[in-house]
Amino acid sequence: YHGCPSECTCSRASQVECTGARIVAVPTPLPWNAMSLQILNTHITELNESPFLNISALIALRIEKNELSRITPGAFRNLGSLRYLSLANNKLQVLPIGLFQGLDSLESLLLSSNQLLQIQPAHFSQCSNLKELQLHGNHLEYIPDGAFDHLVGLTKLNLGKNSLTHISPRVFQHLGNLQVLRLYENRLTDIPMGTFDGLVNLQELALQQNQIGLLSPGLFHNNHNLQRLYLSNNHISQLPPSVFMQLPQLNRLTLFGNSLKELSPGIFGPMPNLRELWLYDNHISSLPDNVFSNLRQLQVLILSRNQISFISPGAFNGLTELRELSLHTNALQDLDGNVFRMLANLQNISLQNNRLRQLPGNIFANVNGLMAIQLQNNQLENLPLGIFDHLGKLCELRLYDNPWRCDSDILPLRNWLLLNQPRLGTDTVPVCFSPANVRGQSLIIINVNVAVPSVHVPEVPSYPETPWYPDTPSYPDTTSVSSTTELTSPVEDYTDLTTIQVTDDRSVWGMTQAQSG
């Protein structure tokens, strides 16, 4: 194979791979016809002048996971055919000016997971054909104006996991072909108006895990092709009314983990491709009419772990396709009887961990397909007669941890629960809170006459006249019901959101994500 170094393996296809801790310098002689060279997991600490001079046909060069901390400016001389260069996972702090000079064919440059402190316009001024630039996982504190001005063909730029505190509004202005811009996990506090104006082809913008407090009203107005917008885990306290107005292609939007206090009507509009919206872990206190009215295709709306105390009757107008609504862990005391009236396709509603004292009898009147209702840990003492009568598909109902008042008025509910026990689950059953002599006893088996002997108990029809029979075909097999433990992606319930569940340098949409790329 035209001379293969002993520390390397060389294939007939001109692929050379050199790995191992015993390698401390670029092996020689390298086969003159090499097209792909990988130098991985070695103890090489520096690249001197022209170590690849005799392999000018090289197309791909990966020098990854080494001890590399110093590169001579002429290290890549004579590699005019090189299309792919990775220096990822090394210990580079400085890039010499002119390092990439002459790499006229270079399309992908990976500099991620090093210790780079700065980049300068001169670093990439020769890389006019570059399409992908990975700079994530370094120590960059700022990007100077002009740094990317010559990279007019760039389609993917990753600046995530650095220490950027601010971005100049001009730094991306010439990147009209950019499709993916990742700025996650930096220290950005605000993004100047106009920063993204030149990015007319942008499809993904990742700004999550910064310290952004305010969004300029027209920040995304030129990004009509944006499909994925990640804004979670910032300090955003308000959304300007028009900020999302011109994003018709959006299909992923994350806003959880911010400081949002209110949402204005029509703020999310029109987004016909958005199916899931995560707004948990904010400070939202109320929901006005028509706040989600443009989200006609929304299937999942997560509003849990806020401070919602008031929901306007028309707050959920337009959400005709909604299947899951999570309102748990808020400050709700009362709900209007019509608040869920428009949610004809709702299957799962989470209302646990609120302060609900009572429910209107018609609260679920139009929501005939409900399969799961979470009402545990509220302040409910009783429920209106017939509240669940029409819910033929209901197979999960959680009522425990409420202060049920077991007087004669509880009899209709008790009788219904008796007939529908399987729907309550086996983990925790509702128990009486008052009167004192029955406190702690199961609501289902309590003898109401014993509980309040002085009260005459009239004959009352049992709750609905539709007992739950496990073998009845009209009821769904309980195994087909989605769990309502509310771990909606991204996981938002009973989880420390700072926890990272890592699997091979990436993680699931379980918590905050730890993924390079």
Partner: antibody, heavy 122, light 107 residues
Framework: QVQLVESGGGLVKPGGSLRLSCAAS????????MSWIRQAPRKGLEWVSS????????YYADSVKGRFSISRDNAKNSLYLQMNSLRAEDTAVYYC???????????????WGQGTMVTVSS | DIVMTQSPSSLSASVGDRVTITCRAS??????LAWYQQKPGKAPKILIY???SLESGVPSRFSGSGSGTDFTLTISSLLPEDFVTYYC?????????FGPGTKVEIK
């Protein structure tokens, strides 16, 4: 270890119904979106349906919309595909797969089951 | 729906050869593309995600590139176990369509 095991396949007549199950183990099932993908004999892969980790969001291919229903039971670490009004063209190996995605560019079916064969024939 | 096309549909090569498979999307999908390998009678296995990122545990002879509408999977030096079928798949929007596949055969 991380594993997905499908079951419920078999021979069914056109117009009939079948329910596929997928048992997951070795990972926190409720953290992940899940999907069904099928492959007709000597053909390519066809995405069928996906479901969000809570079960709230559901997506179908046009070819099965209105006939197939995806669901999950996180308490049982199980994914299901209810297939009604089956047609000859639904004959395929059906795979369940973990749909792993995050906000840093990861999007993939990273774990697959071994597949279960569904044959629709009179 | 986004239509994915792959070329060639099949190719013949020898052990040690370098091969490139192309995948084209009917509209821009940024970098939301994955590549899979499928051996006969087995389930597919993920090779590449985000168009160019190598899945953990996958040999470094596999690499991906591209964004927008044009993508490539390159196997820098074919080994005997690489003579199987390869699929691309877009995750940009539902439905998550696959390419028709490329079968790599021994010459």
């Amino acid at each position: 270890q991380v594993q997905l095991v499908e079951s419920g396949g078999g021979l069914v007549k056109p117009g009939g119904s079948l329910r596929l199950s997928c048992a997951a183990s070795g990972f926190t099932f409720s953290d992940y979106y899940m999907s069904w993908i099928r492959q007709a004999p000597r053909k390519g892969l066809e995405w069928v349906s996906s479901i969000s980790n809570s079960g709230g969001a559901i997506y179908y291919a046009d070819s099965v919309k209105g006939r197939f229903s995806i669901s999950r039971d996180n308490a049982k670490n199980s994914l299901y595909l209810q297939m009604n009004s089956l047609r000859a063209e639904d004959t395929a190996v059906y795979y369940c797969a973990r749909y792993n995605w995050n906000d840093r560019g990861y999007d993939a079916f990273d774990i697959w089951g071994q597949g279960t064969m569904v044959t629709v024939s009179s | 729906d986004i239509v994915m096309t792959q070329s060639p549909s099949s190719l013949s090569a020898s052990v040690g050869d370098r091969v490139t498979i192309t995948c084209r999307a009917s509209q821009g999908i940024s970098s939301a593309l994955a590549w899979y390998q499928q051996k006969p009678g087995k389930a597919p296995k993920i090779l590449i995600y985000d168009a160019s990122s190598l899945e953990s545990g996958v040999p470094s002879r596999f690499s991906g590139s591209g964004s927008g509408t044009d993508f490539t999977l390159t196997i820098s030096s074919l080994l005997p176990e690489d003579f199987v079928t390869y699929y691309c798949q877009q995750f940009n929007s539902y439905p998550h369509t696959f390419g028709p596949g490329t079968k790599v055969e021994i010459k």
